[in-house]
C-alpha cells in the first residue's frame, strides 16, 4: 500500500466575484467506488477544513447545503469551485482524497493550490 499521488495546480487567481476553480487529480491504485474529497486551507500556521464531500464513482459530488464548495467528478479528476472568497481568504488550499471503499483505504494529499483573492475596488460615486 503506497501513498496515493494527488495533483493540483500551484496557483489560481480568484475571479472578481470571489470564485476560484481548480482540478484535483488522483492516481487511483485500485477500482474505488466511494471517494471522499476534502479541501483544507493552510494560512497563518493553521489548517482548517473548508469543505468535504463523499461521492460514488460516476455520481455528482454532494457538499452540504451551506458549503462554499461545489464540484463535479470525471474519472479520477475532481473539478472544485470555491465561492464567496474575499482577500482575507487568500491561502494555500489543499486537496485531500480518500478512497473509502472497497478496502484497502488509500489516502493522498496534494501539494496545495495557492489561491489569491483580490477584493474588487468599489465603484466611484458618480455625479450624474
Amino acid at each position: 500500500c503506497k501513498a496515493m499521488h494527488v495533483a493540483q495546480p500551484a496557483v489560481v487567481l480568484a475571479s472578481s466575484r470571489g470564485i476560484a476553480s481548480f482540478v484535483c487529480e488522483y492516481a487511483s491504485p485500485g477500482k474505488a467506488t466511494e471517494v471522499r474529497v476534502t479541501v483544507l486551507r493552510q494560512a497563518d500556521s493553521q489548517v482548517t477544513e473548508v469543505c468535504a464531500a463523499t461521492y460514488m464513482m460516476g455520481n455528482e459530488l454532494t457538499f452540504l447545503d451551506d458549503s462554499i464548495c461545489t464540484g463535479t467528478s470525471s474519472g479520477n479528476q475532481v473539478n472544485l469551485t470555491i465561492q464567496g472568497l474575499r482577500a482575507m481568504d487568500t491561502g494555500l488550499y489543499i486537496c485531500k482524497v480518500e478512497l473509502m471503499y472497497p478496502p484497502p483505504y488509500y489516502l493522498g494529499i496534494g501539494n496545495g493550490t495557492q489561491i489569491y483573492v483580490i477584493d474588487p475596488e468599489p465603484c466611484p460615486d458618480s455625479d450624474f
Epitope: C1, K2, A3, M4, V6, T38, L40, Q42, S45, Q46, V47, T48, E49, K96, E98, P104, L107, G108, I109, G110, N111, G112
Partner: nanobody
C-alpha cells in the same frame, strides 16, 4: 491495510524517561512522513515530533532538547525517546503517518496538522506525576 500500533506508555515520576514505540505494517514505510502527536481531554491533537523520508526531524518547542524521534526502517518501527518528563507531558500519545512529506517539518508549528496525517495508531497513555 495500513496498521500502526503504539506501545511503551505508562506512569513515571517527573524527571524520568520513557521510550514509545510504534510498529507499522501494510505500506511502504519509508515513503511517508511519520510523527508523534499527543492529546489531552478537551484539547486538539498537537504534533510533538516528525521525521521525514530523508530522516530530518522537527520538534515542537515544548519538547525540544528533551524528546528524540527516530525510526528503524528495517523493523518498520518508529520511536519517541522522552527524557526529563514533566507533568504537562501527560497525554495520550499517537503515532501517525502522512502521505505527503511536504507537510512534515511544518506540522509541529501548525494547528490542525492532524489533517495531514491519515493513518493513526490507537494511542498509548503517558502519565507524569510530580
Amino acid at each position: 491495510q495500513v496498521h500502526l500500533m503504539e506501545s511503551g506508555g505508562g506512569s513515571v515520576q517527573a524527571g524520568g524517561s520513557l521510550r514509545l514505540s510504534c510498529a507499522a505494517s501494510g505500506y511502504t514505510y519509508s515513503r511517508y512522513c511519520l510523527g508523534w502527536f499527543r492529546q489531552t481531554p478537551g484539547k486538539e491533537r498537537e504534533a510533538v515530533a516528525t521525521i521525514d523520508i530523508d530522516g530530518s526531524t522537527s520538534y515542537a518547542d515544548s519538547v525540544k532538547g528533551r524528546f528524540t524521534i527516530s525510526n528503524d526502517n528495517a523493523k518498520n518501527t518508529l520511536y519517541l525517546q522522552m527524557n526529563i518528563l514533566k507533568p504537562e507531558d501527560t497525554a495520550m500519545y499517537y503515532c501517525a503517518a502522512g502521505p505527503n512529506p511536504r507537510y512534515c517539518s511544518g506540522a509541529v508549528y501548525t494547528r490542525g496538522a492532524e489533517h495531514y496525517f491519515g493513518y493513526w495508531g490507537q494511542g498509548t497513555q503517558v502519565t507524569v506525576s510530580s
